[in-house]
Amino acid sequence: QSSLTPLMVNGILGESVTLPLEFPAGEKVNFITWLFNETSLAFIVPHETKSPEIHVTNPKQGKRLNFTQSYSLQLSNLKMEDTGSYRAQISTKTSAKLSSYTLRILRQLRNIQVTNHSQLFQNMTCELHLTCSVEDADDNVSFRWEALGNTLSSQPNLTVSWDPRISSEQDYTCIAENAVSNLSFSVSAQKLCEDVKIQYTDTKM
């Protein structure tokens, strides 16, 4: 990756990520420096026939740092504070090559739920107010509602009217996604409206 266009890399909170380094084949490499937000992370003197010299210079991330055979950076047990700008500088006998990365740490989506507030009108039309949510949602989570493969809404909330006399059985699916995971949850309009109908008739009696 050239320094002008950083490679966007997504990592999952608590898991591992690799920032891939294109090691110059056949060249004499003096050293590789890895930087995080312009602070030195590691200084590596690579070797072909013996073990490389690896000097980890950032104690905070040190224990979670590792390097592949081609000196790509591996970071394990990812934390939110690992988010930021990473750079690798490869110094060879002929030039200095720079690779840039932007690491974004995202949570694996968990516990998708749909809450509903439904109303039954006197004409027997059922109005569904559906709200989709996931645990620890942040700005990186997107929601959409689908029915029969069509997107009805690109928000967590969906309001639909369902008339059992003219509508066939209908499922509404909420899809929650971020760059590293997606979850879905489907609800049946008929089932939800039947539940409302039972409540309605119970209160009438």
């Epitope: 056949g26 004499k28 003096n30 050293f31 003197v45 072909e48 026939t49 110094s91 006998k93």
Partner: antibody
């Protein structure tokens, strides 16, 4: 033990070419770079270039780009440097040297004295 | 190209003396800096590699130091066998360049 064997001397005519050899023994020839260095009396050492025997890739000092050609024969563990269009100023002692991965010359050949004489 | 300015070009010292030879690079070098000793009629012999590391078998009276553009070879307690020409070499970038050499003589 690790050795680089070079012939002692070559006497050549101006305008001709000469191919100097450097035979390695005692180590895996294909994994260490071989460098060539020129020594002229009263002029000090001058780096000519290097070659990786396993990969065949070379790097030449710009000054020697049209003068020197580096090759290897892995079957005989020998590195070669051909010097062409020889002139009197090419008269010198030419060393081959093995380069360690920490980028220093740890083993040297005894050198070949090239004399350009009409 | 990185130019290596080595000084002095010649040096006369007494046995037991401590002497220093300096190489100044035309641009910064990280650690790829070496020192060689060449005795008359012999091949160059590595003394110091990567600025300050003593090569196997080299007496500890030889030491190397420096960073950036200025590098030094120090020989303490000068011995008769130290009579030679000393060269610095930068192997940081192509083309590799040697210093002009320092001819050491005993008074």
């Amino acid at each position: 033990q690790v050795q680089l064997l070079q012939p002692g001397a070559e006497v050549v005519k101006p305008g001709t070419s000469v191919k100097l050899s450097c035979k390695a023994s005692g180590y895996n020839f294909t994994i260490y770079w071989i460098n060539w260095v020129k020594l002229r009396p009263g002029q000090g050492l001058e780096w000519i270039g290097d070659i990786h025997p396993g990969r065949g890739n070379t790097n030449l000092n710009e000054k020697f780009k049209t003068k020197a050609t580096l090759t290897v024969d892995t079957s005989s563990s020998t590195a070669y440097m051909q010097l062409n269009s020889l002139a009197f100023e090419d008269s010198a002692l030419y060393y081959c040297a093995r380069e360690d991965e920490d980028w220093y010359f740890d083993v040297w050949g005894a050198g070949t004295t090239v004399t350009v004489s009409s | 190209d990185i130019q290596m300015n080595q000084s002095p070009s010649s040096l006369s010292a007494s046995l037991g003396d401590t002497i220093t030879i300096t190489c100044r690079a035309s641009q910064g070098i990280s650690i790829w800096f070496n020192w060689y000793q060449q005795k008359s009629g012999n091949i160059p012999k590595l003394l110091i590699y990567k600025t300050s590391n003593l090569h196997t078998g080299v007496p500890p009276r030889f030491s190397g130091s420096g960073s950036g553009t200025d590098f030094t070879l120090t020989i303490s307690s000068l011995q008769p066998e130290d009579i030679a020409t000393y060269y610095c070499l930068q192997s940081q970038s192509y083309p590799y360049t040697f210093g002009g050499g320092t001819k050491l003589e005993i008074k």
